[in-house]
């Protein structure tokens, strides 16, 4: 028995070959012997039953001369899954058609971090098929009647080529995923005390009408609990602020990409925030983490100090050096100091290896007097 796979809504071609490789009389039947179609010697396709009953069934007349008499079934339905019989040259050939339906849950447009379940349904009790989907960038996921893709990323968007294999027979189908998310899952902003701060939250997708609501929660390093800094609505890509904290005095841009500004970086604002965006008609939320690190260099009496506040990695080095000289002090800590600094332009550096994340300069005029 030959096996043919077909996807619901598409077409399937059931083979029937003559050993003579020439035109001959043939008939396609259902397993209950009802005639579907055939050719009875005049090269004319004869259909069984009423036209409306069998209008989805056809054959390839152009292939008959070569001894090929396929049964074409268009707009496949689940109930087409059954055995079909081709009668020719005093023999019967049985062809098993397995029609499967693909469902995507919760759909093919998802939010970053969500999971997609692809399910193959069929009326026939077939053994487990192998389902494999491959992204154009090379990522492969496989399963059987159920295929799961968890923790989806923006880069998982686009076309996936999927194959269903059963008894070495293959059927192809495609799916286009749209994973909505921010371009970056996390970002960090380094600022000297008093500098303006800008946070940008670019989305990694574009849609004509983008509607939803969002909020930025902030956990300052110095604070015991987090606080809502701003809530906003998004309507057709227009941002409108609903509620904003009075300290800091935040401003938010009215158009995408989502953008926030703080008039100045202060130690009490250093910390990390979580921007959440809930989109209309989508379950779940998009998240982006943002971190603010603030640096301050000061001189009090005989002590030159450099401090950083906010979420810094343990491998970051904080240094104090007189310009164009070797570092006087360098530590993997959040504060460094020099006692009785000599006069000149001092530099405080926060660095990751040889990459400087930020620096602050302070002019020491003479021991005990300074000017930033």
């Amino acid at each position: 028995k030959t096996l043919v796979l077909g996807k619901e809504g598409e077409s399937a071609e059931l083979p029937c070959e003559s050993s003579q490789k020439k035109i001959t009389v043939f008939t396609w039947k259902f397993s209950d012997q009802r005639k579907i179609l055939g050719q009875h010697g005049k090269g004319v396709l004869i259909r069984g039953g009423s036209p409306s009953q069998f209008d989805r069934f056809d054959s390839k007349k152009g292939a008959w001369e070569k001894g090929s008499f396929p049964l074409i079934i268009n707009k496949l339905k689940m109930e087409d899954s059954q055995t079909y019989i081709c009668e020719l040259e005093n023999r019967k050939e049985e062809v098993e058609l397995w029609v499967f339906k693909v469902t995507f849950s919760p759909g093919t447009s998802l939010l970053q971090g969500q999971s997609l379940t692809l399910t193959l349904d069929s009326n026939s009790k077939v053994s487990n098929p192998l389902t494999e989907c491959k992204h154009k960038k090379g990522k492969v996921v496989s399963g059987s009647k159920v295929l799961s893709m968890s923790n989806l990323r923006v880069q998982d968007s686009d076309f996936w080529n999927c194959t269903v294999t059963l008894d070495q027979k293959k059927n192809w189908f495609g799916m286009t995923l749209s994973v909505l998310g921010f371009q970056k899952a996390s970002s960090i902003v380094y600022k000297k005390e008093g500098e303006q701060v800008e946070f940008s939250f670019p989305l990694a997708f574009t849609v004509e009408k983008l509607t939803g609501s969002g909020e930025l929660w902030w956990q300052a390093e110095r604070a015991s609990s987090s606080k809502s800094w701003i809530t906003f609505d998004l309507k057709n890509k227009e941002v409108s602020v609903k509620r904003v904290t009075q300290d800091p005095k935040l401003q938010m841009g009215k158009k995408l990409p989502l953008h926030l500004t703080l008039p100045q970086a202060l130690p009490q604002y250093a910390g990390s925030g979580n921007l959440t965006l809930a989109l209309e008609a989508k379950t779940g939320k998009l998240h982006q983490e943002v971190n603010l690190v603030v640096m301050r260099a000061t001189q009090l009496q005989k002590n030159l100090t450099c401090e950083v506040w906010g979420p810094t990695s343990p491998k970051l080095m904080l240094s104090l050096k007189l310009e164009n000289k070797e570092a006087k002090v360098s530590k993997r800590e959040k504060a460094v100091w020099v006692l009785n600094p000599e006069a000149g332009m001092w530099q405080c550096l926060l660095s990751d290896g040889d990459k400087v994340k930020m620096d602050s300069r302070i002019q020491v005029l003479s021991r005990g007097v300074n000017q930033t």
């Epitope: 701060v197 057709n236 227009e238 409108s240 602020v241 938010m252 841009g253 009215k254 158009k255 500004t261």
Partner: antibody
């Protein structure tokens, strides 16, 4: 060609009310955000109020908040500014302006209508 | 509200001169700033949007730039028709705010 024509200006006593209209032609009104901008005699430009294309979001300068109301009637392609509790400092030429598709700038302006608040 | 500080408030120059007008924003406003020209008794006209995008029909002698929260309008070679008042406008967020204006006069 897109054109904006303001009307409804005039002389009004302090504490009085006026309704300004801005009739638009040559555009699909509901697509664009609109604004009212004023200019007091011999002074600079002051943004007064704005409304989103959908008409759902309205915005005001602090100087007029609670006294002025911006609305639009998409079926009539008309923008309105209802001005209540008028003060002498509201005396100005009032311009209506259409914003670009992505709120980039005010690309079309009306010729203005004069409002004088005086006893 | 975001404050826009425009300078100078007035400027005398001659035809052919290179002129710069500056606006400083009290907050970061990305590139969401436009420059407008107004002649006496007329409505304002947009010259530049989004900091540096020259509007169609505006001569190329007009240009805009940004450094942090400082925005500059430059007229490379003044023409007689350029004598007018110039305003910057932040449209980053509501309420929008104009600069105080710069009156450009013939020296």
């Amino acid at each position: 060609e897109v054109e904006l024509l303001e009307s409804g200006g005039g002389l009004v006593q302090p504490g009085g009310s006026l309704r300004l209209s801005c009739a638009a032609s040559g555009l699909t009104f509901s697509t664009f955000a609109m604004s009212w901008v004023r200019q007091a005699p011999g002074k600079g430009l002051e943004w007064v109020s704005g409304i989103s294309g959908s008409g759902e979001n309205t915005y005001y300068a602090d100087s007029v908040k609670g006294r002025f109301t911006i609305t639009s009637d998409n079926s009539k392609n008309t923008l309105y500014l209802q001005m209540n509790s008028l003060r002498a400092e509201d005396t100005a030429v009032y311009y209506c302006a259409k914003e670009g598709y992505n709120w980039n700038y005010m690309d079309v302006w009306g010729k203005g209508t004069t409002v004088t608040v005086s006893s | 509200a975001i404050q826009m500080t425009q300078s100078p408030s007035s400027l005398s120059a001659s035809v052919g001169d290179r002129v710069t007008i500056t606006c400083r924003a009290s907050h970061g406003i990305r590139n969401d700033l436009g420059w407008y020209q107004q002649k006496p008794g007329k409505a304002p006209k947009v010259l530049i949007s989004e900091t540096s995008s020259l509007q169609s029909g505006v001569p190329s002698r007009f240009s805009g730039s940004r450094s942090g929260t400082d925005f500059t309008l430059t007229i490379s070679s003044l023409q007689p028709e350029d004598f007018a008042t110039y305003y910057c406008l932040q449209d980053y967020t509501y309420p929008y705010t104009f600069g105080q204006g710069t009156k450009l006069e013939i020296k």
